[in-house]
């Protein structure tokens, strides 16, 4: 690794902007939208829109703020105590196993399947069973066995895809 | 650059200084860290001096190790060496990279035994 | 004290394979999370910090992911040289957690 001192090679504190605020730690910690320095003696504020702390803490910097992804909308943005509020574009949802990506929303229930609950940001159309009322599992059917939420139009293999 | 040296036979209970020696970068601008390897076993962390001079030490360390610095060199005072800190001794250079910081830079070790 | 957890202990693989090492730390470490390389004899090589991001002449085959306490190395197209002990390690991000080290993973390339 090259010994040349870059700018972002420095330690927070040496490279924080004089605006930024200092305040003395309390018990050790620093309030929400601080970090500590390295000695332990002040808080630094983190960086609006770059950087928050949501709660009190002895980290070294703040934390980074989070970019929405394309696919996503940005419901709230990042501010010193709070990280931004990314949610997945209509027609797509994010599911708890997968959460790095959004993905579109199946258009319709398998066969002999009923929808019972929309496609919303944070799941899938939710089918369950005409006779017994179980909730199917989710996984993508085979295209002749699609009925989509539109009745006479064909299944596309498109609006499969997840 | 750095480089560690110091490391010698010691009888337990006798104090030993090792020394990291840094050229090419100011020690007013890095943290330095120090890390042993016991033979055949891996990497143990000790403690931490930051840019300004504040050490820090791993819970297990506490008391055992005392950590300081001059313009160039940064020393690990070993207190009352036992043969369980048999081991190469490194020091690192700790870089800041925006959000973390991480030992980019390290010395070639130096060998500290421990027996009686 | 936090503990990182690494896992497997070993691993073996052949050349152009993949393989995976996982890494648990005992709290929350947010994304302060590095990847060393240690061949015999030699110093400890950082690979990734940062959870993710590639230390310097690092080739793009080492990769990095997770956040939080659930970590993972990945080396892919496996070479001869890539034959070594790998290491995680909690980076220094507060001032009063340790910056433990995992065990250890030994990667042999068959």
């Known amino acids: 690794e090259s010994a040349l001192i870059t700018q972002q090679d420095l330690a927070p504190q040496q490279r924080a902007a004089p605006q930024q605020k200092r305040s003395s730690p309390s018990e050790g910690l620093c309030p929400p939208g601080h970090h500590i320095s390295e000695d332990g003696r002040d808080c630094i504020s983190c960086k609006y829109g770059q950087d928050y702390s949501t709660h009190w803490n002895d980290l070294l910097f703040c934390l980074r703020c989070t970019r929405c992804d394309s696919g996503e909308v940005e419901l709230s943005p990042c501010t010193t105590t709070r990280n931004t509020v990314c949610q997945c574009e209509e027609g797509t949802f994010r599911e708890e196993d997968s959460p790095e990506m959004c993905r579109k929303c199946r258009t319709g229930c398998p066969r002999g399947m009923v929808k019972v609950g929309d496609c919303t940001p944070w799941s899938d159309i939710e089918c369950v069973h005409k006779e017994s009322g179980t909730k199917h599992s989710g996984e993508v059917p085979a295209v002749e066995e699609t009925v989509t939420s539109s009745p006479g139009t064909p299944a596309s293999p498109c609006s499969l895809s997840g | 650059s750095v480089e560690e040296s110091g490391g010698r036979l010691v009888t337990p209970g006798t104090p030993l200084t090792l020394t990291c020696t840094v050229s090419g970068f100011s020690l007013s601008n890095y943290a330095m860290s120090w890390v042993r390897q016991a033979p055949g076993k891996g990497l143990e962390w000790i403690g931490i001096?930051?840019?300004?001079?504040t050490t820090y030490y791993a819970s297990w360390a506490k008391g055992r190790f005392t950590i300081s610095k001059t313009s160039t060199t940064v020393d690990l005072k070993v207190t009352s060496p036992t043969t369980e800190d048999t081991a190469t001794y490194f020091c690192?250079?700790?870089?800041?990279?925006?959000?973390?910081?991480?030992?980019?830079?390290w010395g070639p070790g130096t060998l500290v035994t421990v027996s009686s | 004290a936090l503990v990182m957890t690494q896992t497997p202990s070993s691993v073996s693989a052949a050349v152009g394979g993949t393989v995976t090492i996982n890494c648990q730390a005992s709290?929350?470490?947010?994304?302060?999370l590095a990847w060393f390389q240690q061949k015999p004899g030699q110093p400890p090589k950082l690979l990734i910090y940062?959870?993710?991001k590639l230390a310097s002449g690092v080739p793009s085959r080492f990769s990095g992911s997770g956040s939080g306490t659930e970590f993972t190395l990945t080396i892919s197209d496996l070479e001869c040289d890539d034959a070594a002990t790998y290491y995680c390690?909690?980076?220094?991000?507060?001032?009063?957690?340790?910056?433990?080290f995992g065990g250890g993973t030994e990667v042999v390339v068959k």
């Open positions: 390690q909690s980076s220094w991000h507060s001032i009063s957690t340790d910056c433990a």
């Open positions: 001096i930051s840019s300004s001079g």
């Open positions: 940062e959870t993710s």
């Open positions: 709290q929350n470490i947010y994304s302060n």
């Open positions: 690192a250079r700790e870089t800041y990279y925006g959000y973390s910081y991480a030992a980019g830079l």
